[in-house]
């Protein structure tokens, strides 16, 4: 005959541990059930009667089978810089996540807890490396024949035109300008130094280049003194 | 020991203006780059401004024009100078520091109040 199965909440055989979906109570020494993800135990279990859940208040929630006493807060809602990408329910916290053209610049478990917008290079500075959802543009100086006219998140440096005849040199911040006969365009974007002979090569002004270590505006993980704790407030 | 701490902070009527302070003590102040983020009462945190090693600056769209950031190299210190204030930008201020080339905050002070009243 196959085994009885046992209600909760019951003795558990010594040695073997309480089944899915339950919990040893150290105070009753019996298993008993777990509340179901969006509840909590409002009653805890005693030898004789098993937990009594309830659903979570608004603006908390539950995702787990648990025994909490009670819900999770759900975090503070989205800023004006933020998505929400998941609402807050009895069964899960509100997430968060930046809008186009900011990142990450400090993540908790799910979601972001504060966003910064990226950086936008000035003239004769492009972008060495671009912004991902965590972490900020990184800025570098335009290097010799090549330059950024643009305050940008997105441009790199690009080669000056090459002239048949130079009116202006390029610098960092400008393109050559040509005398009236057509300039051939340098078909390398990003090129350093440009195969020209050196009396049409166009004059740069190299600008006070930033440490080699570009700075970067993203703070992810919080290593000196912690950031502020969490605001939590309700719908 | 590493150190920010944050001064400049009280009580303005709407319009007026404040002087943010954060004297950084501990590490070497010209390798990290500077931020002012803020905390509204039960608020998660808004990130108002920062400033790059070449002094470049960014702000939110909330203080653009109104606020100005700034630091002081030789003085270890970061400035926000906060000018015609609304009672939206009643907050706790804090500033931050980042080392250069990581990605990561590595410092943050304990920050300032900002009460703006209408």
């Known amino acids: 005959l196959p085994a009885q199965v046992a209600f909760t909440p019951y003795a558990p055989e010594p040695g073997s541990t309480c089944r899915l979906r339950e919990y040893y109570d150290q105070t009753a020494q019996m298993c008993c059930s777990k509340c179901s993800p969006g509840q909590h135990a409002k009653v805890f279990c005693t030898k004789t009667s098993d937990t009594v859940c309830d659903s979570c208040e608004d603006s908390t929630y539950t995702q787990l089978w648990n025994w909490v006493p009670e819900c999770l807060s759900c975090g503070s809602r989205c800023s004006s810089d933020q998505v929400e990408t998941q609402a807050c329910t009895r069964e899960q916290n509100r997430i968060c996540t930046c809008r186009p053209g900011w990142y990450c610049a400090l993540s908790k478990q799910e979601g972001c807890r504060l966003c910064a917008p990226l950086r936008k290079c000035r003239p004769g500075f492009g972008v060495a490396r671009p912004g991902t959802e965590t972490s900020d543009v990184v800025c570098k100086p335009c290097a010799p024949g090549t330059f950024s006219n643009t305050t940008s998140s997105t441009d790199i440096c690009r080669p000056h035109q090459i002239c048949n005849v130079v009116a202006i040199p390029g610098n960092a911040s400008m393109d050559a300008v040509c005398t009236s006969t057509s300039p051939t365009r340098s078909m390398a974007p990003g090129a350093v130094h440009l195969p020209q002979p050196v009396s049409t090569r166009s004059q740069h002004t190299q600008p006070t280049p930033e440490p080699s270590t570009a700075p970067s505006t993203s703070f992810l993980l919080p290593m000196g003194p912690s950031p502020p704790a969490e605001g939590s407030t309700g719908d | 020991h590493v150190q920010l701490v944050e001064s400049g902070g009280g009580s303005v009527q709407a319009g007026g203006s404040l002087r943010l302070s954060c004297a950084a003590s501990?590490?070497?102040?010209?390798?990290?780059?500077m931020s002012w983020v803020r905390q509204a009462p039960g608020k998660g945190l808004e990130w108002v401004s920062a400033?790059?090693?070449?002094?470049?600056?960014n702000y939110s769209d909330s203080v653009k024009g109104r606020f100005t950031i700034s630091k002081d190299n030789a003085k270890n210190t970061l400035y926000l100078q906060m000018n015609s204030l609304k009672p939206e930008d009643t907050a706790m201020y804090y500033c931050?520091?980042?080392?250069?080339?990581?990605?990561?905050?590595?410092?943050w002070g304990q920050g300032t109040q900002v009460t703006v009243s209408s």
């Open positions: 501990g590490f070497t102040f010209s390798s990290y780059y």
């Open positions: 931050a520091a980042i080392r250069i080339g990581t990605d990561q905050y590595k410092f």
């Open positions: 400033i790059y090693s070449d002094d470049s600056d």
